[in-house]
Amino acid sequence: NFMYSKTVKRLSKLREYQQYHPSLTCVMEGKDIEDWSCCPTPWTSFQSSCYFISTGMQSWTKSQKNCSVMGADLVVINTREEQDFIIQNLKRNSSYFLGLSDPGGRRHWQWVDQTPYNENVTFWHSGEPNNLDERCAIINFRSSEEWGWNDIHCHVPQKSICKMKKIYI
């Protein structure tokens, strides 16, 4: 009976996600058969989050909208380890929007999920950010410094990275 009600709960939770994520990839967390963590297929997972590389070229606003209709946000990078994971799936000749912007052009950078901007946990390329009209952040590859962040004009279409919390069922 307990297993039946658990299964019913799982099914109703899965139905919530079905519109945008018809397929989920789930793994068992720990030793308890009750705990499964899922990411939409073909998103990748790292720690408690799921990631999706969007290859459509969009402005920053539309990239964020694209993530939001999938129940996600543009990526908020919290640690070096997280960035190291993300870059494994990126192409060196492309740039990708992050969930980081400076809407007023006053160098008050803010993350889309309101995570406080911590200058000590940023990975700007040297000399960046460097232009008050460039109010959105991308991650890209420079041969001299490998992967890092750059400020660019928000209307220039780029690829993007979406991030959402894992789905626990």
Epitope: Q58, T61, K62, D133, H153, H155, V156
Partner: antibody, heavy 118, light 107 residues
């Protein structure tokens, strides 16, 4: 007032290149991105790509990739669109357009007719 | 790439008529749609953006509606200066494609 003034009409031979200019005035040149759109005679409109004058960042329509190059000269507030390996189907009026804060084309150049003929 | 299908390709109408032009996208463009008016030998002029927001200086007889993939431009009472070609364009992702155009002619 905002103005985009384009260079004059050009006649080119197949295989040649053409470089069309678009001079901006009446606003801060490096604050807005510029797009290029073309229109073949009696036909519809086709988006070619965009350039951000502040850094020179570009994004091109894949259809033109390898043939189109967009550049800018901040000292003269001018953007350029160069199309190479011209063929007769490239005969068109080429327009530059500014993307406004609302992310739509709010101002357009007057257009430049490029004729490709042997 | 998102394709934009505009209909009709041409129509004949009289001054004072109500005119409706439709634009269908091949995918959801989330209201990121513009409508332009173009007269012969001139550059297009922005009429509406975000599917329904009137651009500066555009008369209120022009209106837009729609969502998802289907959008409409309406001219409530056609004026002599409205005879022109109208284009839709999406701005969801590149390439920012245009509809094929609708030529509004005098009946």
């Amino acid at each position: 007032q905002v103005q985009l003034v384009q260079s004059g009409a050009e006649v080119k031979k197949p295989g040649a290149s053409v470089k069309v200019s678009c001079k901006a005035s009446g606003y801060t040149f490096t604050s807005y991105i510029i797009h290029w759109v073309r229109q073949a005679p009696g036909q519809g409109l086709e988006w070619m790509g965009t350039i951000y004058p502040g850094s020179g960042d570009t994004s091109y329509n894949q259809k033109f990739k390898g043939r189109v190059t967009m550049t800018r000269d901040t000292s003269t507030s001018t953007v350029y669109m160069e199309l190479s390996s011209l063929r007769s189907e490239d005969t068109a009026v080429y327009y530059c357009a500014r993307m406004g804060d609302n992310e739509y084309f709010d101002y357009w150049g007057q257009g430049t007719l490029v004729t490709v003929s042997s | 790439d998102i394709q934009m299908t505009q209909s009709p390709s041409s129509l004949s109408a009289s001054v004072g008529d109500r005119v409706t032009i439709t634009c269908r996208a091949s995918g959801n463009i989330h209201n990121y749609l513009a409508w332009y008016q173009q007269k012969p030998g001139k550059a297009p002029k922005l009429l509406l953006y975000d599917a329904e927001t009137l651009a500066d200086g555009v008369p209120s007889r022009f209106s837009g509606s729609g969502s998802g993939t289907d959008y409409t431009l309406t001219i409530s009472s056609l004026q002599p200066e409205d005879f022109a070609t109208y284009y839709c364009q999406h701005f969801w992702s590149t390439p920012y494609t245009f509809g094929g155009g609708t030529k509004v002619e005098i009946k």
